[in-house]
């Protein structure tokens, strides 16, 4: 039987597969047409009649060529901490991803099952590793000569200003206070600039030691709140 001349349904030659977009129906023992994405098999094929396909109903879908009797249900609506990045259509499931300021704590095949707010580093701590779509912020204590006076998921430790005359020495959570009218800001060569909120003061940074690669201990799951990790604060 030359390829692609027989019309479905047809009995394949022994040892031959069915052709493109066909499946072998064990009951009919025939090669039959699959249904296209957005459809499902309303009536299965027989020895004399091909598959009858029908469109998926609202809120259901099939993404692949198939011969399923019913379309799959689209996932539930996205929660308030998520945005819908792909709508539910006859050919694709809804996809929900985390909104800005949140990360995916529990992913699913496509999109996110559970979003969690990005950790905020409290004063005296800065961002060692920024948050991503799937990982939380990692905080670290500000090294000597640097400070952070904010509670933020983006701010890093910044160098103290250099005073001609120091009024109040800086610490990990506070900048130095100068008596001089013209303080000079320390500028490290090859400074790294992480994304930061716009501020009225200059925010030069200096290279910092590599953050610890120890895993975050604050992992928000629906089993109730856990104590915040060192240097972080809950929302």
């Amino acid at each position: 039987l030359p390829a692609q001349v027989a019309f479905t349904p047809y009995a394949p030659e022994p040892g031959s597969t069915c052709r493109l977009r066909e499946y072998y129906d064990q009951t009919a023992q025939m090669c039959c047409s699959k249904c296209s994405p957005g459809q499902h098999a309303k009536v299965f094929c027989t020895k004399t009649s091909d598959t009858v396909c029908d469109s998926c109903e609202d809120s259901t879908y099939t993404q692949l060529w198939n011969w399923v009797p019913e379309c799959l249900s689209c996932g539930s609506r996205c929660s308030s901490d998520q945005v819908e990045t792909q709508a539910c259509t006859r050919e694709q499931n809804r996809i929900c991803t985390c909104r800005p300021g949140w990360y995916c704590a529990l992913s699913k095949q496509e999109g996110c099952r559970l979003c969690a707010p990005l950790r905020k580093c409290r004063p005296g701590f800065g961002v060692a590793r920024p948050g991503t779509e799937t990982s939380d912020v990692v905080c670290k204590p500000c090294a000597p000569g640097t400070f952070s006076n904010t509670t933020s998921s983006t701010d890093i430790c910044r160098p103290h200003q250099i005073c001609n005359v120091v009024a109040i020495p800086g610490n990990a959570s506070m900048d130095a206070v100068c008596t001089s009218t013209s303080p000079t800001r320390s500028m490290a060569p090859g400074a790294v600039h992480l994304p930061q909120p716009v501020s009225t003061r200059s925010q030069h940074t200096q290279p910092t030691p590599e953050p610890s690669t120890a895993p975050s201990t604050s992992f928000l799951l629906p089993m109730g709140p856990s104590p915040p990790a060192e240097g972080s604060t809950g929302d």
Partner: antibody, heavy 119, light 107 residues
Amino acid sequence: QVQLVQSGAEVKKPGASVKVSCKASGYTFITYDINWVRQAPGQGLEWIGWIYPRDGNTQYAQKFQGRVTMTTDTSTSTAYMELRSLRSDDTAVYYCARGDRDYGYFDVWGQGTTVTVSS
Amino acid sequence: DIQMTQSPSSLSASVGDRVTITCRASQDISNYLNWYQQKPGKAPKLLIYFKSKLHSGVPSRFSGSGSGTDFTLTISSLQPEDFATYYCQQGNTLPLTFGGGTKLEIK
């Protein structure tokens, strides 16, 4: 990662047979067709056929029917293509490729096996 | 068998250029048109399937369009790594058939 690794180059005499192997890794071997495609020197691509490893059933291009045999060994995730009665115009690079039977594309390719037919 | 005809057979262009390659099928193949890139001594790589769906990991500067018998592959802004030979292939009917290829060279 998903990959297909083919056997080494072969030199054959006209009238002989050649058997090329293709070892799959990084995915479930039995759930995708393995296709064979060849490319003569400086020429385009030509589809030879496919085999479905789950049941060993095949689909060959008419041109190669009777001269080609595709087989698989699911225990080693390896596909084989044997071409018989070789002629000089069978000199080509033979590729195995994982195929999608719904859209008819080849998404993962082996590195190719050069088969030279010369007297 | 369905014949696939590509044009041009070769093409010279510069980095940053917008390039279009066309592929014509001898009969209607709906949207079952796939595009591959091949570099010398290497296996082809899938770029686009089902006329316009980008294969995973393929840069968005590649796009496909058309339907029925006439299709195009467009590279919006040529990069140095894009100089290669491009093949179209129909996935509508057996036997699966390829175009003769378009060699994209540096001008």
